[in-house]
Each structure stands twice: as C-alpha cells, then as structure tokens.
C-alpha cells in the first residue's frame, strides 16, 4: 500500500521540500503532540459490561517499542447481577495505527512503515442470527 | 526497505534508540491480514452502547481519512430496546500514530504525529467514589 502523492489541484510542491531518494520518504520520528491530555473515563476496562484486560507487547525493533493490546475477558457480557450472560457477546473494538519497523540485513539497517491493528477495548453486542434459507 | 550502512564496528555498535530522522520505503507493510471487516463493521449498531461514525479528513495527514466514533446515547440500550440511564455509554479513546506532511504540502517528507481518536463506545456501570 503506497502513500498517495499529493493531488496536483490542491498542492503545489514547495521549493522548501527536502530532496528524497526515489521510492522512499523522509520521516521525522520526533512525535507531534507527544504529551497530549487524554480525558477518558476512569477504569472503564473493569466497569464495562464487556470488560477487558491489557497486555503490553514489547519489540525493540519497533517504534514505538511498546504497544498495548486489550483482550475481552468474557465471551458473553456481564449482567446487572454480575454474572456472565452468554446470550450477548463481548467483542473487541480495533483501530489501525502506524509503527516504524527496523530491519537488520547483515551490517545494514533499513526502516519500514507498518500498519498495526490494535485492540482498544470491548463492547457488548446483540448476536446476529443468520437465518438459513 | 531503504538500506543504511552501519558503523564500521557494526557488530558491537548496536544502537538501542531509533535515530530522530529515518528514510523509509514508500510501501507500507500491512500486518492486518487476519481481520474480518464484515463481521465487525456493524458493531456500532449492534452494541448496547451504539455509536455514530464521523469522517475526519485532512489531506496533510496519512491516513487522510479517519473515522471518529460518537456515542449515540447517555445511557445504554437494555433488553427491551430502551435507553437505561442507570448505565453509561462512554467512548473508548486511543492514541494512534499518523504521518503529518512536514514541511506542509511536501509529497515525501513526513513527521509522526500522535492523535487521540474515539474508536467506539462501551457500556459501563456508574462508579461512585466514597468521600471519607
């Protein structure tokens, strides 16, 4: 999957653009908005009717090296009595993010952008029943 | 990817940190081969905390289109299909990395940017912090 070139109608390539070898792009990995405020509700992973746990995956050849993945705790959803109701389903909600992968080839190193699918949390859904003809 | 020569003493000079600027291949490797979008595409409607999806488009960013979730209700949908205000629909937010064209409008020069997106909603029980 290639990054689309800028559209000619909207963009004019400025003179200030840095020279880049063919087939590659320059990437500054100093992150913009590194310390933004996240105002998510408290402890939603344990309070949800479809609760989840977090696992941290670590890879020194990936940037960022730490990626947090959620896993739904139950197949069903937690009802008002605190019991699992298997007539409903806990399902993962996923989001794509970009990472930079460092690859070693002998005494050389190369960098590749990767799309990674992150499970962010879980939601409780009503099951879909496909009626067979 | 684009190969960069290492230092002469390469076996002993393993750099634990990523350099500030790297040259990367224009092709993006997609690891997400085992997903079934048909199955998950209607979660936003079937959830007990359903959400709407809003298109956020920015040509200076890659990906240029990001879908933002917004919970439809304050409460959650109960077994009768009504909104139950004893429960709360809350957004699940996630910080993701995108590419920002830098300098602006340049075709092959980017900087990583962290953005906060709302991915979906989940139904939670109210939490009460008892004050001492």
């Amino acid at each position: 999957r290639k990054i689309p070139k800028v559209g000619h109608t909207f963009f004019q390539k400025p003179e200030s653009c840095p020279p880049v070898p063919g087939g590659s792009m320059k990437l500054d990995i100093g992150i913009i908005n590194e310390n933004q405020r996240v105002s998510m509700s408290r402890n939603i992973e344990s309070r949800s009717t479809s609760p989840w746990n977090y696992t941290v995956t670590w890879d020194p050849n990936r940037y960022p090296s730490e990626v947090v993945q959620a896993q739904c705790r139950n197949l069903g959803c937690i009802n008002a009595q605190g019991k699992e109701d298997i007539s409903m389903n806990s399902v993962p909600i996923q989001q794509e993010t970009l990472v930079v992968r460092r690859k070693h080839q002998g005494c050389s190193v190369s960098f590749q952008l990767e799309k990674v699918l992150v499970t962010v949390g879980c939601t409780c859904v009503t099951p879909v029943i496909h009626h067979v003809q | 990817g684009i190969t960069i020569p290492r230092n002469p003493g390469c076996p002993n000079s393993e750099d634990k940190n990523f350099p500030r600027t790297v040259m990367v291949n224009l092709n993006i490797h997609n690891r997400n081969t085992n997903t079934n979008p048909k199955r998950s595409s209607d979660y936003y409607n079937r959830s007990t905390s359903p959400w709407n999806l809003h298109r956020n488009e920015d040509p200076e960013r890659y990906p240029s289109v990001i879908w933002e979730a917004k919970c439809r209700h304050l409460g959650c949908i109960n077994a009768d299909g009504n909104v139950d205000y004893h429960m709360n629909s809350v957004p699940i937010q996630q910080e993701i990395l995108v590419l920002r064209r830098e300098p602006p409008h340049c075709p092959n020069s980017f900087r990583l940017e962290k953005i906060l997106v709302s991915v979906g909603c989940t139904c939670v029980t109210p939490i009460v912090h008892h004050v001492a």
Epitope: S39, S41 | N88, S89, P91, Q93, P126
Partner: nanobody
C-alpha cells in the same frame, strides 16, 4: 452517599426566566463535575450544560447557548442553571448529575458523561 436534589422548576411564559438549583451532598465539586440534562415527554434525555469547578470551565448545548448560564456556590455545594428567554421547546424534566468526565471533544452523547448519580428531576413547563 452521593445525592443531588433539583429545585426551582415551574410554569413560565415564553420569553420568561427560571433559575434551577442543584444541591449536592455526600461529595464536593472537586470530586465530580456537574452536568445539567433534560428529558421532554417521549424524547431521549439530552445534555444541556456542563460545569467543572477545578478550572471553572462550562459547556452548553447549541440549543441553549446564549440563553442558559451555569454557576456554582461552593460554600453551599450548589450549582445553578439560569434559564432566560425560555421557549416552549425547553419544556422538559431537568436533571442535574454528578459526572466523572468533562470532555469538550464530545465523543460521548454529550460533553460531560459517565454519570455517577442522577437527581430526581424538576419539571419546567414553558407555555406559549
């Protein structure tokens, strides 16, 4: 125990004013933000206004901007909703609620969400 009691509702003519009060007990405004919500007959509950005492930020639904104002008296642990230029469409039961989250990006159904406790509500009727 966290409790909220609304008062100040009533019948008023279009163009008139009312001031609703939300008396809180069992917590202080440092613990939670306060949201005002309303529910018209046969309709869903909707957000009206949010207030956070930590930095005095307020938020209003588009439908009430410029007409409603939220304020607080920390000494009395009470939040007020001043409603001016009332319209028949403002007729509803008004609720205040202690909420965990005030998020102006409004990814939830309203900018303040994750309700801890609802008040019992107070009826506001605006006649034409």
């Amino acid at each position: 125990e966290v409790q909220l009691v609304e008062s100040g509702g009533g019948l008023v003519q279009a163009g008139g004013s009312l001031r609703l009060s939300c008396a809180a007990s069992g917590f202080t405004f440092d613990d939670y933000d306060i949201g005002w919500f309303r529910q018209a007959p046969g309709k869903e509950r909707e957000g009206v206004s949010c207030f956070t005492s930590s930095d005095g930020r307020t938020f209003y639904a588009d439908s009430v901007k410029g007409r409603f104002t939220v304020s607080a008296d920390n000494a009395k642990n009470t939040v007020y909703l001043q409603m001016n230029s009332l319209e028949p469409e403002d007729t509803a039961v008004y609720f205040c609620a202690a909420v965990n989250t005030f998020d102006e990006s409004a990814y939830a159904a309203f900018a303040c969400y994750d309700v801890v406790r609802w008040g019992q509500g107070t009826q506001v009727t605006v006649s034409s």
